[in-house]
Amino acid sequence: VLPRWRQQWSGSGTTSRFPETVLARCVKYTEVHPEMRHVDCQSVWDAFKGAFISKYPCNITEEDYQPLVKLGTQTVPCNKTLLWSRIKDLAHQFTQVQRDMFTLEDMLLGYLADDLTWCGEFNTFEINYQSCPDWRKDCSNNPVSVFWKTVSRRFAETACGVVHVMLNGSRSKIFDKNSTFGSVEVHNLQPEKVQALEAWVIHGGREDSRDLCQDPTIKELESIISKRNIRFFCKNIYRPDKFLQCVKNPEDSSCLSGI
């Protein structure tokens, strides 16, 4: 029997053991988070699967993910949302220490999909483990990109109070309009609920005295935010290692000086 023809995409294929990983993560999450104990993980997997299985992987819509989004509805307390751009690891290290603040990946849906890739094939129930569409080389409406756009939009929409964002000061564009933060989250913060956005600009390796809050791209971010009637604040985090240490031990005498 000849193998059926399969579309070749430029991106890597679905993460191995994808269904098992999603299901296992869901079970683990609901066990650790009492407020999500009511969630039926089989239903979550079915909704996740239903968003991309049998569908052409370059024609996925936010609508496809609505059943999953509905099942994973969660709220973050006001002032506790942490967005990030191009500095995921530090943001996650921070929320692991500062347990009352939350990134998207600390929420059920973000936790389920973090670092995973997936896609299906048109008119078959199979998962494509060989290749999936690349955002640049193939198409932007692929299952992974649309998922993150959908859940990022929702995460930003539900944020309230003072929202924080961690930005990578080592990049040429500290604020990048094309990032998920710049293209989705910034535009979906609700001025009626969000009083301010506070950026934390994380400095790179070498200790320097630049004020990255005056970086042109940060000024651009402030311009976008202020036009939406949201106040903007900014802090330089000159020493990320010390910053994390001080989050762990705020009483440490060295934490009284600047970080």
């Epitope: 005056q214 042109p216 311009s223």
Partner: antibody
Framework: EVQLLESGGGLVQPGGSLRLSCAAS????????MNWVRQAPGKGLEWVST????????YYADSVKGRFTISRDNSKNTLYLQMNSLRAEDTAVYYC?????????????WGQGTTVTVSS | QSVLTQPPSASGTPGQRVTISCSGS????????VYWYQQVPGTAPKLLIY???QRPSGVPDRFSGSKSGTSASLAISGLQSDDEADYYC???????????FGGGTKLTVL
Amino acid sequence: EVQLLESGGGLVQPGGSLRLSCAASGFTFSDYWMNWVRQAPGKGLEWVSTISISGGIIYYADSVKGRFTISRDNSKNTLYLQMNSLRAEDTAVYYCAKDNWNDYYGMDVWGQGTTVTVSS
Amino acid sequence: QSVLTQPPSASGTPGQRVTISCSGSTSNIRDNYVYWYQQVPGTAPKLLIYKDDQRPSGVPDRFSGSKSGTSASLAISGLQSDDEADYYCATWDGSLNGRVFGGGTKLTVL
């Protein structure tokens, strides 16, 4: 034409107060960081204060900290400098200046200045 | 006493090349962009060089900026009589958390 026009200067006694204004025109005021810089008679330029677009980020020179307050009203395209507890050494021409587009600390448009004299 | 050190005066004849120096430290010049302003007596300052060596449109290419370590320089070639003015370097100082100017250099065209 891009223009900045300062007003509000004058003669004031030590310990007194004054409020300077800077009216902006010819550019989108609400897209730019703004500054106050002063120049004492026969002396060099001294940076006084900087305010960000929405007013959430503000810097002051040590020499004016706690006495001067920078603010802005984007709906009126106006920058302000409230000066309290004035001293003789605050006597200077006060310039307002806008930050250069797509830049860090450069100031590309300056007003003609308003003179503040602190004397008894 | 300015944080950035400039010579109080400099001079040259028409057509000559003159260089004005600006000396600082790691917390200002080394880590941050340097700016140069020209101020003709009785008028407002004018931005001459930004981001170390960039010229705003309208500034002649006779003016050039450079930086090395904790020092910066402004070079003016083909000196002209209307270049007679005060020149100021400026940058950000991370220790002071503020913008800083040099004391200024008075350029005389002989």
